[in-house]
Interface confidence: low
């Protein structure tokens, strides 16, 4: 069964990497490398950092999928993240009480300067760093529909922890159906697993920078551990282009 | 950016139509097509035919997927099924009046004449016939888990619908636990999802064969119709072959 | 997508997924699967046609990537991208199986 | 699986993914990436050695299915099969912005 | 120390156009959102719109939608609001005012307001 | 009419407490936006005193305090002082309006 053709490996290599130059060029719709003239010298930001982290931490979390790949796909998303809606914001005010869940409000016109037209988003996801628990709970999360209404998205179980995790919940479609909405305050809420016959309904797990346990808020501190939306879009400008050559082949 | 080299499509048909040929027969392990001897004259059994349609049926509703695939998932799985034990059972005294739920039981020891070996089992679905509804739900299904226990499996959002439609549930991990156990009776439980300050927990959902509602149980007339599990697994002469063979590259 | 709703419609001289149909009896002299009588296959076929060079005019050839060549292979390959499975009935002696093969009808095709 | 795990520890002389680590700096002489400085990107290599014909003899080559032509292709090539992304930061102007691009890492291969 | 200076007010006819801008300073312009309010004479304050960080996302007042369009370069730290088919009604000082947090529409500061007077 | 309803007028001795209020609805200030309080001397722009309910703005004396509860925001002056004579605004996000923000009909306090 042997093919009894030698292959040059080092020319493969070197097409390949040829091909890489190519592809990542492409992904990013640039002609050539982009000018380097104006880059501020000394570290990246810190922000920038934490945003490739977490990113960079998602894709090895991720299992290795070869999905079929929409055109649209193809190309780089950029990555932003929108944070939660302080703590201190009146708008918690009425949630404060309950026992069986916790709130996440957002504010949509920050999540449009990240993502202005619907269609550009390609994923959303709710992050939240889960503080250590010896316990095991089953939990939901829901996004807030109408005034006093919740609508069901996910559940998961969580087993007891010796660290802090983060928990990633995919909610693409729930904030695209914000961005298509006017501007204004939208939220998840996050809770306890009631069974039909539960008495003890009670959410156990304390999330980073929202737990009503963890008096002044404290969490708040580290800002980056409080919940957020992690975005990935198509960059507006990489998007017209896209529109504009869809039909052609 | 021609290749310009033409290619005889006749060729290639021809070349892809005996590498099929190969494909189907080293998918059942077979070196040769079986042979036709002692097969009975007159069509096919209804309950295969009625087996056949539900797994093609089952096809036709997945997105295809290019799921990286498993040695072991590359030969062909044998399909069979294995109905609910009935109505008239004893073991449904206890659940009549639950209005929250309905509840279905198995017997291990039908499961295990299917599937001699846990790890034979491929996929495990439990299929259920819904009956035409003109409300919206939130079901759960359970397991069950010791003698008062159930433990979460999933759930789904059923929308109204005006003709009976087949709900499948993903129970794989649940029948494989089962079968690893000794005989007996094992179940689940299909529940209205009930939340933390709902008061209306009632299931409204019917289900072919199951639901209280149907006096004398007219859906076991229809039995193919009543909740069965539906199961894929390698048949044990080609396991062992398998087994045999999967350290050799 | 080079899928069978583009490919089947079109005459794309790149890769693309093409039509074929296996009918058990007449294309395999096969009498012994009693469901189904055949099934479309299908196949794929056709060039991945990439320039690579480290003197190549990128902007001429990057938009071809997305097509050509998205994985950036030394050497693209037109090959099957969504597969689906079959289910077939045959007898083994006088006892009637259903069985479902992996991966039998391909559905688009990719450069890879 | 022909993944990392069994690749990179065996001397496959068929498809199988092979280590390519590319730095940005000198392989690419890019300066402008900023993190990460390179990535595995690795790549699929390797014969898919199905023999087919009208007359071969089957018992032979049946078991050489699963690994080298699981596809029934009619000329089996040797493919990216999982995938991963790759985030990057760069900057445009005066500000950086992260990125990720799909499918950039080769985690295993199969013949197709 | 945070700065806006309004100008490009002054006297136009019923019908007449004008546009204001407001130069800001002493903060990164880009991070945040921008709005304009008035106050007719004698009367309380009233919203006018507002243009979010990047210029994506623009809100304007039922009186003047269709009328005034919002705009800003970020380039120059400069805010702009190009006022078409003027009425008496819309005589007022015109403010500038800026988001306390990006979006937040709280106003931390504000401009010393430049005048617009529409009359025949 | 405002949305957001003020007192046109109050009047204070110096020393004494007074208290401003701003009436609204589950659409503004009972939705939980941000509720801010400003302040504006003849002649002058305005300033903002509270942000956010019940947060004091850099420089503003501690005097001056905020509080809301369901649809009633309240501003509190303790120890009325003469250049606290002025014209008190609330102002809120209201997602009911397609105008978006609204400012209340002002109070103009008055130091006797």
């Known amino acids: 069964l042997s093919t009894c053709k030698t292959i040059d490996m080092e020319l493969v290599k070197r097409k390949r990497i040829e091909a890489i130059r190519g592809q990542i060029l492409s992904k990013l719709r640039l002609a050539s490398p982009p000018s380097q003239g104006e880059v501020p010298p000394g570290p990246l930001p810190e922000a920038v950092l934490a945003l490739y982290n977490s990113t960079r931490d998602r894709v090895a979390g991720e299992s290795a999928d070869p999905e079929p790949e929409p055109e649209a796909d193809y190309y780089a998303k950029e990555v932003t993240r929108v944070l939660m809606v302080d703590r201190n914001n009146a708008i918690y005010e009425k949630t404060k009480d309950i026992s069986h869940s916790i709130y996440m409000f957002f504010n949509t016109s920050d999540i449009r300067e990240a993502v202005p037209e619907p269609p550009l988003l390609s994923r959303a996801e709710l992050r939240l760093q889960r503080l250590k628990s010896s316990v095991e709970q089953h939990v939901e999360l829901y996004q807030k529909y109408s005034n006093n209404s919740w609508r069901y998205l996910g559940n998961r179980l969580l087993t007891p922890t010796d660290t802090p995790e983060w928990l990633s919940f995919d909610v693409t479609g729930v904030v695209r159906q914000w961005l298509n909405q006017g501007d204004g305050i939208q939220g998840f809420r996050f809770s306890a697993h009631c069974s039909c016959d539960s008495k003890d309904n009670k959410l156990h797990v304390e999330i980073n920078g929202i737990s009503p346990k963890r008096r002044g808020d404290l969490g708040t501190i580290h800002d980056m551990n409080r919940p957020f939306l992690l975005l990935m879009a198509t960059p507006l400008e990489r998007a017209q282009h896209l529109h504009s050559s869809r039909h052609r082949r | 950016l021609s290749t310009c080299k033409t290619i005889d499509m006749e060729l290639v048909k021809r070349k892809r139509i005996e590498a099929i040929r190969g494909q189907i027969l080293s998918k059942l392990r077979l070196a040769s097509p079986p042979s036709q001897g002692e097969v009975p004259p007159g069509p096919l059994p209804e309950a295969v035919l009625a087996l056949y349609n539900s797994t093609r049926d089952r096809v036709a509703g997945e997105s295809a997927d290019p799921e990286p695939e498993p040695e072991a998932d590359y030969y062909a799985k044998e399909v069979t099924r294995v109905l609910m034990v009935d109505r008239n059972n004893a073991i449904y005294e206890k659940t009549k009046d639950i209005s929250h739920s309905i509840y279905m039981f198995f017997n291990t020891s039908d499961i295990r004449e299917a599937v001699p070996e846990p790890p034979l089992l491929s996929r495990a679905e439990l299929r259920l016939q819904r009956l035409k509804s003109s409300v919206e739900q939130h079901v759960e299904l359970y397991q069950k888990y010791s003698n008062n226990s159930w433990r979460y499996l999933g759930n789904r959002l059923l929308t109204p619908t005006d003709t009976p439609e087949w709900l499948s549930f993903d129970v794989t991990g649940v029948v494989r636990q089962w079968l690893n156990q000794g005989d007996g009776i094992q179940g689940f439980r299909f529940s209205a999802h009930c939340s933390c300050d709902s008061k209306d927990n009632k299931l409204h959902v019917e289900i072919n064969g199951i639901s209280p509602k149907r006096r004398g149980d007219l859906g076991t007339i229809h039995d193919m119709n009543r909740p069965f599990l539906l199961l894929m697994a390698t048949p044990l002469e080609r396991a062992q072959h398998l087994h045999s063979s999967r350290h050799r590259r | 997508a080079l899928d069978t709703n583009y490919c089947f419609s079109s005459t794309e001289k790149n890769c693309c997924v093409r039509q074929l149909y296996i009918d058990f009896r007449k294309d395999l002299g096969w009498k012994w699967i009693h469901e189904p009588k055949g099934y479309h296959a299908n196949f794929c076929l056709g060039p991945c046609p990439y320039i690579w060079s480290l003197d190549t005019q990128y902007s001429k050839v990057l938009a071809l990537y997305n097509q050509h060549n998205p994985g950036a292979s030394a050497s693209p390959c037109c090959v099957p991208q969504a597969l689906e499975p079959l289910p077939i009935v045959y007898y083994v002696g006088r006892k009637p199986k259903v069985e479902q093969l992996s991966n039998m009808i391909v559905r688009s095709c990719k450069c890879s | 699986a022909l993944d990392t795990n069994y690749c990179f520890s065996s001397t496959e002389k068929n498809c199988c993914v092979r280590q390519l680590y590319i730095d940005f700096r000198k392989d690419l002489g890019w300066k402008w990436i900023h993190e990460p400085k390179g990535y595995h990107a690795n790549f699929c290599l390797g014969p898919c050695p199905y023999i087919w014909s009208l007359d071969t003899q089957y018992s032979k080559v049946l078991a050489l299915y699963n690994q080298h032509n699981p596809g029934a292709s009619a000329s089996p090539c040797c493919v990216p099969q999982a995938l991963e992304p790759l985030p990057i930061v760069y900057y445009v102007g005066r500000k950086p912005k992260v990125e990720q691009l799909s499918n950039m890492i080769v985690r295993s291969c199969k013949c197709s | 120390e945070v700065q806006l200076v309004e100008s490009g007010g002054g006297l136009v006819q019923p019908g007449g156009s004008l546009r204001l801008s407001c130069a800001a300073s002493g903060f990164t312009f880009s991070n945040y959102g921008v709005h304009w309010v008035r106050q007719a004479p004698g009367k309380g304050l009233e919203w006018v719109s507002h243009i979010s960080a990047a210029g994506i996302s623009r809100y304007y007042a039922d009186a003047v939608k269709g009328r005034f369009t919002m705009s800003r370069d970020n380039g120059k730290n400069t805010l702009y609001l190009q006022m078409n088919g003027l009425k008496s009604e819309d005589t007022a000082v015109y403010y500038c005012a800026k988001d306390r947090i990006r979006s937040s529409y709280e106003y931390d500061s504000w401009g010393q307001g430049t005048q617009v007077t529409v009359s025949s | 009419l405002p949305v957001l309803t003020q007192l046109s007028s109050m009047s204070g001795s110096p020393g004494q407490t007074v208290t401003i209020t701003c009436t609204g609805s589950?659409?503004?200030?009972?939705?939980?936006?941000?509720l801010s309080w400003y302040q504006q001397l003849p002649g002058t722009a305005p300033k903002l005193l509270i942000y956010n309910a019940n947060n004091r703005a850099s420089g503003v004396p501690n005097r001056f305090s905020g509080s809301k509860s369901g649809n009633l925001a309240s501003l509190t002056i303790t120890g009325l002082q003469a250049e606290d004579e002025a014209d008190y605004y609330c102002?809120?996000?209201?997602?009911?309006?397609?105008?978006?923000?609204?400012f209340g009909g002002g109070t103009k306090l008055t130091v006797l």
């Open positions: 102002g809120c996000y209201d997602s009911s309006l397609s105008t978006g923000y609204v």
């Open positions: 589950s659409s503004n200030i009972g939705g939980g936006y941000y």
